[in-house]
């Protein structure tokens, strides 16, 4: 671990209460193949415990979608992940739309410091799905 | 290559007869800028031979596709990556729909284990693209 | 340095004049989150200083846009990220269109030599949005 | 095994329309197109139009305002419809499919509708 | 549209001998890494049957001896060794867009 391997990959355990657009994370061996290796989970949301540049993941599929649903019928969907705490650190790092697809899914290079905690806002009328291998998110420290 | 630096890059060489929906994938420096450092093919589909956890990635583009040969026109089009083999360890790691686009992409962060055999199943009634630069599949050992 | 730890993550600075279809980048902690770790810029385009393995990844959000600015209002928009020079390499490594989304994000495993110079064009009648968290640009040098 | 078995008429006077029927068996028109083919002395082998999955229908452009197709799924059939005949439209009529893909290239095709169009 | 034009028109070969036929397209018939051409085989009364698609896939059942190739707009079928029931009109088609168009038809005979 000293070589600063720190790496994580989680899957979905729920959205968040009615105002909070947060997704909630959750990762172990237990649960399939997610898993935590150096960050850490609070409150369902994912720490860095370690400084470095990160490769930032993510996929997101929207449940019981159609391109239709996507569209016209529904408010416009984003993903954006994020910085959230501590506050004076606060930033989008990546925002993606859904438009008329069902799953956006992407990846950046990105400085993260100890004790920044990563938010995953999800806004719109329609829920993630919670199948592993449709929606998840990661890190991966690439450098020092 | 004892530091565990498996990765390869993988081109499409053809789809499966009738019944099989995998994709058939082939690499090497003859083919272009396609390799294979450590994992291996056997008929086609790409095998595991160091545990640890990968970085796995594709993209797939559909043959002389628009959106509305996604949409409504045509079978819904799914790509899944998993592992098919051994059947023990048989799991759906990755899976995207098209819907109204022609390209999916993404990529995810799973432990592996020697012997795994990956495979790509393209379901629907289109074609995937068989330029090098539209249609490729790859993993990168990350750590152990 | 010496581990060859090359790692480049760009913002869009601008995008070319009439004819040239090349969106131009910078990079550097003064501009936000990118930086250039080994790579360099060379009037907005990213040149390689190392051989090896590399992991290219970009993502692209067009500014102002819905899913019907990109299906009939609009001539087809396509990225295609490239080895522009030397121009013995020159090569589409990863190319993807547009559709009816607004935006792309991919990644893929190529191999780059020192002096390879990395253009990434734009086509289509859309402006690509200058928000670092819609669209970004990077690489990291993953093995020899 | 797949089949298209096609039904239809023989002679038909000039300026009448023309109506094919193609039952399917072994597949699902919710998941596959049926295209329309007719070869003449004249023409040759010549492509008309196509009906997709989900009803909608791509035509053979120099034909469009004469063509018309439409479909049955639960009871596995295409139809065929063809206004204003000449006698240059004097074919044998073919509804065909593709194995596997949407793409436009048949192994399967029905017997073929004569169709004679004469005064 | 893409015109496809087939030569010769007619050829007699000899059994046992190799007959080959050549298919010409107004404009490019390949895009995703496919070229777009196919052949068919049609006898008196029947239906076309399609003997190769993607320019060179053998359909199920299709004898060996028959084979194509070529790629942007020139394409060959080729039979060897030829056999008394190849004796048919064999016609290529492209599917790159629509519509898709066939070619004239080149009729094989047996000397």
């Known amino acids: 671990e000293s070589l600063g391997w720190d790496i994580a990959e989680l899957q979905l355990n729920h959205t968040g209460p009615q105002q909070d657009p947060r997704l909630y994370w959750q990762g172990g061996p237990a649960l399939g193949r997610s898993f935590l290796r150096g960050p850490e989970l609070d409150k369902g949301q994912l720490r860095i415990r370690r400084d470095g540049i990160y490769m930032v993941h993510i996929q997101v599929t929207l449940a019981i979608c159609s391109s239709t649903s996507t569209s016209r019928h529904h408010h416009p969907t984003t993903l954006a992940v994020g910085i959230c705490s501590p506050a004076s650190r606060s930033i989008s790092l990546l925002r993606l739309s859904f438009h008329q697809g069902c799953t956006i899914a992407s990846q950046r290079l990105t400085p993260l410091a100890r004790g920044d905690t990563l938010c995953t806002n999800l806004t719109g009328t329609l829920l993630p799905s919670r199948n592993t291998d449709e929606t998840f998110f990661g890190v991966q420290w690439v450098r020092p | 290559e004892s530091l565990g630096w498996d990765i390869a890059e993988l081109q499409l060489n053809h789809t499966g007869p009738q019944q099989d929906p995998r994709l058939y994938w082939q690499g090497g420096p003859a083919l272009g800028r396609s390799f294979l450092r450590g994992p291996e093919l056997d008929k086609g589909q790409l095998r595991i031979r160091r545990d640890g956890i990968y970085m796995v990635h594709i993209q797939v583009t559909l043959a002389i596709c628009s959106s509305t040969s996604t949409s409504r026109h045509h079978h819904p089009t799914t790509l899944a990556v998993g592992i098919c083999s051994p059947a023990s360890r048989s799991i759906s790691l990755l899976r995207l729909s098209f819907h109204q686009g022609c390209t999916i992409a993404s990529q995810r962060l799973t432990p592996l284990a020697r012997g795994d055999t990956l495979c790509t199943n393209l379901t629907g009634t289109l074609l995937p693209s068989r330029n090098t630069d539209e249609t490729f599949f790859g993993v990168q050992w990350v750590r152990p | 340095e010496s581990l060859g730890w090359d790692i480049a993550e760009l913002q869009l600075n601008h995008t070319g004049p009439q004819q040239d279809p090349r969106l131009y980048w910078q990079g550097g902690p003064a501009l936000g989150r990118s930086f250039l770790r080994g790579p360099e810029l060379d009037k907005g385009q990213l040149r390689i200083r190392r051989d090896g393995i590399y992991m290219v990844h970009i993502q692209v959000t067009l500014a102002i846009c819905s899913s019907t600015s990109t299906s009939r209002h609009h001539h087809p928009t396509t990225l295609a990220v490239g080895i522009c020079s030397p121009a013995s390499r020159s090569i589409s490594l990863l190319r993807l269109s547009f559709h009816q989304g607004c935006t792309i994000a991919s990644q893929r495993l190529t191999p780059l030599a020192r002096g390879d110079t990395l253009c990434t064009n734009l086509t289509g009648t859309l402006l690509p949005s200058r928000n670092t968290d819609e669209t970004f640009f990077g690489v990291q040098w993953v093995r020899p | 095994q797949v089949q298209l078995k096609q039904s239809g008429p023989g002679p038909v006077q000039p300026s009448q329309s023309l109506s094919i029927t193609c039952t399917v068996s072994?597949?699902?028109?919710?998941?596959?197109?049926i295209h329309w083919v007719r070869q003449s002395p004249g023409k040759g082998l010549e492509w008309l139009g196509v009906?997709?999955?989900?009803?909608?229908?791509d035509y053979n452009v120099a034909l469009m305002s004469r063509l018309n197709i439409t479909k049955d799924n639960s009871k596995s059939q295409v139809f065929f419809k063809m206004n204003s005949l000449q006698t240059d439209d004097t074919a044998i009529y073919y509804c065909?499919?593709?194995?596997?893909?949407?793409?436009?290239?048949?192994?399967?095709w029905g017997q073929g509708t004569l169709v004679s169009v004469s005064a | 549209d893409i015109v496809l034009t087939q030569s010769p028109a007619s050829l007699a070969v000899s059994l046992g001998q190799r007959a080959t036929i050549s298919c010409r397209a107004s404009?490019?018939?390949?895009?995703?890494?496919?070229?777009?051409l196919h052949w068919y085989q049609q006898k008196p009364g029947q239906p076309p049957k399609l003997l190769i698609y993607?320019?060179?896939n053998l359909e199920s059942g299709v004898p060996a001896r028959f084979s194509g190739s070529g790629s942007g707009t020139d394409f060959t079928l080729n039979i060897h060794p030829v056999e008394e029931e190849d004796a048919a009109t064999y016609y290529c088609?492209?599917?790159?867009?629509?519509?898709?168009?066939f070619g004239a038809g080149t009729k094989l005979e047996l000397k």
């Open positions: 009906i997709w999955r989900d009803g909608s229908t």
């Open positions: 072994d597949f699902s028109l919710t998941i596959f197109g």
């Open positions: 065909a499919k593709n194995r596997r893909y949407d793409y436009a290239w048949f192994p399967y």
């Open positions: 404009k490019s018939v390949s895009a995703s890494g496919y070229s777009f």
């Open positions: 993607l320019t060179s």
């Open positions: 088609q492209h599917s790159r867009d629509f519509p898709p168009t």
